[in-house]
């Protein structure tokens, strides 16, 4: 289409645009202090403020330091990008026992299953190894995931993991666990990024530039900024993000520079009257009868998750809102029915953790 490839003269006389010969298009000229998010920006929202290397632009439009993965027990999972922090995780052979924003405060070595136990779930960066008793007839010496993959049911004890103190320990002082020490270190060296690519090719901010003056051709970020808790709407106005401060609401998505915070009804409730980016009226889920099935999951979480039965088997027990509006979600897959006795139960949304009480009945974990 002609409008997709305008001639150079169509940009003349328009100081807010310039012609890019490489893409043969008119491009939007970002104001000083900001730079394009793409090769040929088309509108102010294609421009953004720039941060110095190793910083990212957070939702409140502030340059914020990316976390560092420099501790011996951490490796970089995702690099520092212009709009998101670097993310660190425990290095191979370790799992996170105390999480931190975009990182892990304390890593432990994965447990080695003791004699008579086999690996049910291998350890990950987030979870420790899960062990289970070896099936009858299986050799007690069978203690590695390679030799013992036979599924089994029963209790799931875990060996005590070995802690790594981020402040005082280094890789060389870790105790050897089951001969895996060298393998872990080798794997760590392979997966640790030798040099973070996050700052490569990112121009650093010139402190002499004023972010409010018109900027020279090809320079960047021109979009209007809003205060924290405000977003730039389609009309280019700073508009308040909705608030989820009501007791029956929880935040679904955060307030971003170009979109409002969105709220949804808290676990155990359903939206009866919707509102823009939120719910004007939440009502408790109704009591309804249904069969349930238990879904096995990683028992290291020490709880049991329950699933709704297959589609079509669930009775229709949605609340009828006063205004006749359909609830936000009526799909049977949106909620979990908890019923260890196959009696009347309360549906629980998937986001709510469900734990077994000492009586064996599931209880909603308030978290």
């Amino acid at each position: 289409f002609p409008q997709d490839r305008p001639f150079e003269d169509t940009c003349h006389g328009n100081p807010s645009h310039y012609y890019d010969k490489a893409v043969r298009r008119c491009c939007y000229r970002c104001p000083m202090g900001l730079f394009p998010t793409q090769q040929c920006p088309q509108r102010p929202t294609d421009c953004r403020k720039q941060c110095e290397p190793d910083y990212y632009l957070d939702e409140a439009d502030r340059c914020t330091a990316c976390v560092t993965c420099s501790r011996d027990d951490l490796v970089e999972k995702t690099p520092c990008a212009w709009n998101s922090s670097r993310v660190c995780e425990c290095r191979p052979g370790m799992f996170c026992s105390t999480s931190a924003v975009n990182s892990c405060a304390r890593c432990f070595f994965h447990s080695v299953c003791p004699a008579g136990m086999i690996v049910k779930f291998p350890g990950t960066a987030q979870k420790n190894t899960v062990c289970e008793p070896a099936s009858p007839g299986v050799s007690p010496a069978c203690a590695s995931p390679e030799n013992c993959k036979e599924p089994s049911s029963g209790t799931i004890p875990q060996a005590k993991p070995t802690p790594v103190s981020p402040a005082t320990s280094s890789a060389s002082t870790m105790p050897v666990r089951g001969g895996t020490r060298l393998a872990q270190e080798a794997a760590s060296k392979l997966t640790r990024a030798p040099d973070s690519p996050s700052s490569v090719g990112r121009p650093s901010s010139d402190p002499g530039l004023s972010p409010t003056q018109p900027c020279p051709e090809g320079s960047g970020d021109c979009r209007k900024q809003c205060e924290p808790d405000y977003y730039l709407d389609e009309a280019g106005r700073c508009t308040a993000c909705v608030s989820c401060s009501r007791d029956d609401l929880v935040e679904k998505t955060p307030c971003a520079w170009n979109s409002s915070r969105t709220c949804e009804c808290r676990p155990g409730m359903i939206c009866a009257t919707s509102a823009t980016n939120s719910c004007a009226r939440c009502v408790p889920y109704p009591i309804c009868a249904a069969e349930t099935v238990t879904k096995p999951q990683d028992m290291a979480e020490k709880d049991t998750t329950f699933e709704a039965p297959p589609l079509g088997t669930q009775p229709d027990c949605n609340p009828t809102p006063e205004n006749g509006e359909a609830p936000a979600s009526t799909s049977p897959t949106q909620s979990l029915l908890v019923d260890s006795q196959a009696s009347k139960t309360l549906p629980i949304p998937t986001s709510a953790p469900v734990a077994l009480s000492s009586t064996g009945k599931p209880v909603l974990d308030a978290g």
Partner: antibody, heavy 121, light 106 residues
Framework: LLHESGAEVAKPGASVKMSCKAS????????MHWIKQRPGQGLEWIGY????????DYNQNFKDKATLTADKSSRTAYMQLSSLTSEDSTVYYC????????????????WGQGTLVTVSA | NIVMTQSPRSMSMSVGERVTLSCKAS??????VSWYQQKPEQSPKLLIY???NRYTGVPDRFTGSGSATDFTLTISSVQAEDLADYHC?????????FGGGTKLEI
């Protein structure tokens, strides 16, 4: 918390620059707002500045009238009014929004004592 | 810009009476409305934020209510020290705008 400079007297067509010194909080955390109040009239928002970056935004009515700046080292925000006329003779306040808990928008619990500008030939 | 209209422009009350001040927005402002009290020769003081949240130290005789376009500030039992101008303001959409004020005389 916010201490504004003293009264200013200026001639028509001249400029004045008033200051607002912040104390008791991290100056760069909160954006500084400026508000005009004419005698017996309502409040009028002029604009704000992000002291951390120097980023400013103005009410369209004040784009050619006010210039906002901030000096992080002295924890002071400034507003310069140019091409003064009798319409500019009034009180100007610097103000700061409260914390975002509960997210109730830009509500202003902290105000300077005001700077009176008098434009007189 | 969103226009905030306050009524009445002024009112005279006796101590102990119930006072109701009105503020209307030209378009939906959700609950992003604040109320300010301004005594003669003083800076405005925040009374209510988020339409109904009483600010720290504000006496409980002051109550805010409303949402969308209609907002009310109520003084349940007016006192002599409540003599002041009262301003409402919205911060839902920039620029923030304020009403013309209501002068309360005791």
């Amino acid at each position: 918390l916010l201490h504004e400079s003293g009264a200013e007297v200026a001639k028509p067509g001249a400029s004045v620059k008033m200051s607002c010194k912040a104390s008791g909080y991290t100056f760069t955390t909160y954006w500084m707002h400026w508000i005009k109040q004419r005698p017996g009239q309502g409040l009028e928002w002029i604009g704000y500045i992000n002291p951390s970056t120097g980023y400013t935004d103005y009410n369209q009515n004040f784009k050619d009238k006010a210039t906002l700046t901030a000096d992080k080292s002295s924890r002071t925000a400034y507003m310069q009014l140019s091409s003064l006329t009798s319409e500019d003779s009034t009180v100007y306040y610097c103000t700061r929004r409260g914390p975002s808990y509960g997210n109730h928008g830009a509500w202003f619990p902290y105000w300077g004592q005001g700077t009176l500008v008098t434009v007189s030939a | 810009n969103i226009v905030m209209t306050q009524s009445p422009r002024s009112m005279s009350m006796s101590v102990g009476e119930r006072v109701t001040l009105s503020c209307k927005a030209s378009e939906n402002v959700d609950t992003y409305v604040s109320w300010y009290q301004q005594k003669p020769e003083q800076s405005p003081k925040l009374l209510i934020y988020g339409a109904s949240n009483r600010y720290t130290g504000v006496p409980d005789r002051f109550t805010g209510s409303g949402s969308a376009t209609d907002f009310t500030l109520t003084i349940s039992s007016v006192q002599a020290e409540d003599l002041a101008d009262y301003h409402c303001g919205q911060s839902y959409r920039y620029p923030p705008t304020f009403g013309g004020g209501t002068k309360l005389e005791i």
